[in-house]
């Protein structure tokens, strides 16, 4: 019973988890235009990882996307890469999860296949939520970086003979949305992974029998018998994925200004 | 598009009047109301903004004593309300609908409000 | 408060000149989020309001006649009238819309000889 509620859980956890990722992947709220400085403009931007958006005071607002793919920071294509990987993991362990359920019989499929399907599915999430929470954090860190570097130049002059005022952009609440789903993801790809262990068959060890030879007596008492699981001394598909394989190699220098318009 | 404001006012200095500006022919909830005061032979100054849906409120620093923007969206008008009045006060107030670029798209015909003993 | 001043003060032409007017900000009203320059033309006649002549320093309010162009960017902005006629006697204002309070400029008036 507790293995099925774990099981579920997982399985609810992970889903709001995958939804969130979905929604902040697509949300235009990347980073906002910090304000704390500079309350007094009648134009809010923000960005998301598709397009940026212009909110004028008087309602409109005009959102364009960033219709080239070779001009864009390498950062943000690194970004976008990992959100739809975890988004794409995450709907792949959603599949397989649903068919592990223990609360749903398909056929005649052992505990052990289920066993199995839980614990790929239960690892396709953490590594989802992993990608999503990396993605979430590479933007966020690029944010950080370009704040500051705006900041020390806030007001730079054509020659120094302009002020024009620099946008400076903070958090936007996509990230929030995104590091919360990812933890989510994450939790419910534990709680996956707990839940195949109960699943797996228990070790069934047989009480001795005597056997009564004519003659003499003679018991005979066999080891405990071990089912093959993969978790026992039979490993013969233990490693069943092997998440983490993650290169770094995209990520280069990226331009000062969080402007891809 | 039109934007109809009350006519002109003769008031006392010291005391209060309240300017209106109906609107027709377009969403009244869907845009800005802004406010603008001209002086006799002067320039344009911005007064400030309401936002019929919400009710919420931008004010030019200058007018936030003086004025007080409302609006009612059953009846589709604005209303703005000067206190204390003193002859500076003396002026046409003209209501605009905010269009793109944050400009004032429609104007009202405006309302000559004169301060005098 | 961001100061608009406009040049000349006045101007008189005759119909069917050019005429240029300046409008010149104390800050850039350029955008970095979407590159358009906050900035506003109105024309007002005797004895009426404003009418809106451009937005975004150079898009044409629909209806304005294709001899009103606004351009410029960053703090310095132009409004052209490529042939004046009777009817463009009027001050003329440009009002930045990107900093609030939003402020005007003081008129350049056009009359015509």
């Known amino acids: 019973m507790a293995v099925t509620a774990c099981q579920g859980l997982g399985f609810v956890v992970s889903l709001i988890g995958i939804a969130g990722i979905i929604a902040a992947t697509c949300m235009d709220q990347w980073s906002t235009q910090d304000l704390y400085n500079n309350p007094v403009t009648a134009v809010f931007n923000y960005q998301g990882l598709w397009r940026s958006c212009v909110r004028e005071s008087s309602g409109f607002t005009e959102c364009r996307g960033y219709f080239t793919l070779l001009g864009l920071p390498a950062m943000l294509q690194a970004v976008r890469a990992l959100m739809i990987v975890g988004i794409v993991l995450g709907a792949i362990g959603l599949l397989v999860s649903i068919f592990a359920l223990k609360c749903i019989r398909i056929g005649s499929m052992e505990d052990s296949a289920k066993a199995n399907m839980t614990l790929t599915s239960g690892i396709m999430f953490i590594v989802s939520g992993l990608c999503a929470i990396a993605g979430v954090s590479v933007f966020a860190n690029m944010l950080v970086t370009n704040f500051w570097m705006s900041t020390a130049n806030m007001y730079t002059g054509m020659g120094g003979m302009v002020q024009t005022v620099q946008t400076r952009y903070t958090f936007g609440a996509a990230l929030f949305v995104g590091w919360v789903a990812g933890g989510l993801t994450l939790i419910g790809g534990v709680m996956m992974c707990i839940a195949c262990r109960g699943l797996a068959p228990e070790e069934t060890n047989y009480k001795a029998v005597s056997y009564h030879a004519s003659g003499h007596s003679v018991a005979y008492k066999p080891g405990g018998f071990k089912a093959s699981t993969g978790f026992g001394s039979n490993t013969k598909n233990k490693k069943i994925y092997d998440g983490g394989a993650r290169t770094e190699d995209e990520v280069q220098s990226y331009p000062s200004k969080h402007d891809y318009v | 598009v039109q934007l109809q404001e009350s006519g002109a006012e003769l008031v006392r200095p010291g005391t209060s009047v309240k300017v209106s500006c109906k609107a027709s022919r377009y969403a009244f909830t869907n845009y800005l109301i802004e406010w603008v005061k001209q002086r006799p032979g002067q320039g344009l100054e911005w007064i400030g903004m309401i936002n019929p849906g919400s009710g919420g409120t931008h004010y030019n620093e200058k007018f936030k004593v003086k004025a007080t923007l409302t609006a009612d969206k059953s009846s589709s008008t604005a209303y703005m309300q000067l206190n204390s009045l003193t002859s500076d006060d003396s002026a046409v107030y003209f209501c605009a609908r905010g269009g793109f670029g944050n400009s004032f798209a429609y104007w009202g015909q405006g309302t000559l409000v004169t301060v005098s003993a | 408060d961001i100061m608009m001043t406009q040049t000349p003060l006045s101007l008189t032409v005759t119909a069917g000149e050019k005429v240029t007017m300046s409008c010149k900000s104390s800050?850039?009203?350029?955008?970095?989020?979407?590159?358009?320059?906050?900035l506003t033309w109105y024309q007002q006649k005797p004895g009426q309001p404003p009418k809106l002549l451009t937005y975004?320093?150079?898009t044409r309010e629909s209806g304005v006649p294709a001899r009103f162009t606004g351009s410029g960017s960053g703090t310095d902005f132009t409004l052209t009238i490529s042939s004046v006629q009777a009817e463009d006697l009027a001050v003329y204002y440009c009002?930045?819309?990107?900093?609030?309070?939003?402020?005007f400029g003081g008129g350049t008036k056009l009359e015509i000889k």
């Open positions: 800050q850039s009203l350029l955008n970095g989020g979407n590159l358009k320059n906050y």
């Open positions: 975004w320093a150079s």
């Open positions: 009002q930045n819309g990107y900093f609030y309070p939003y402020t």
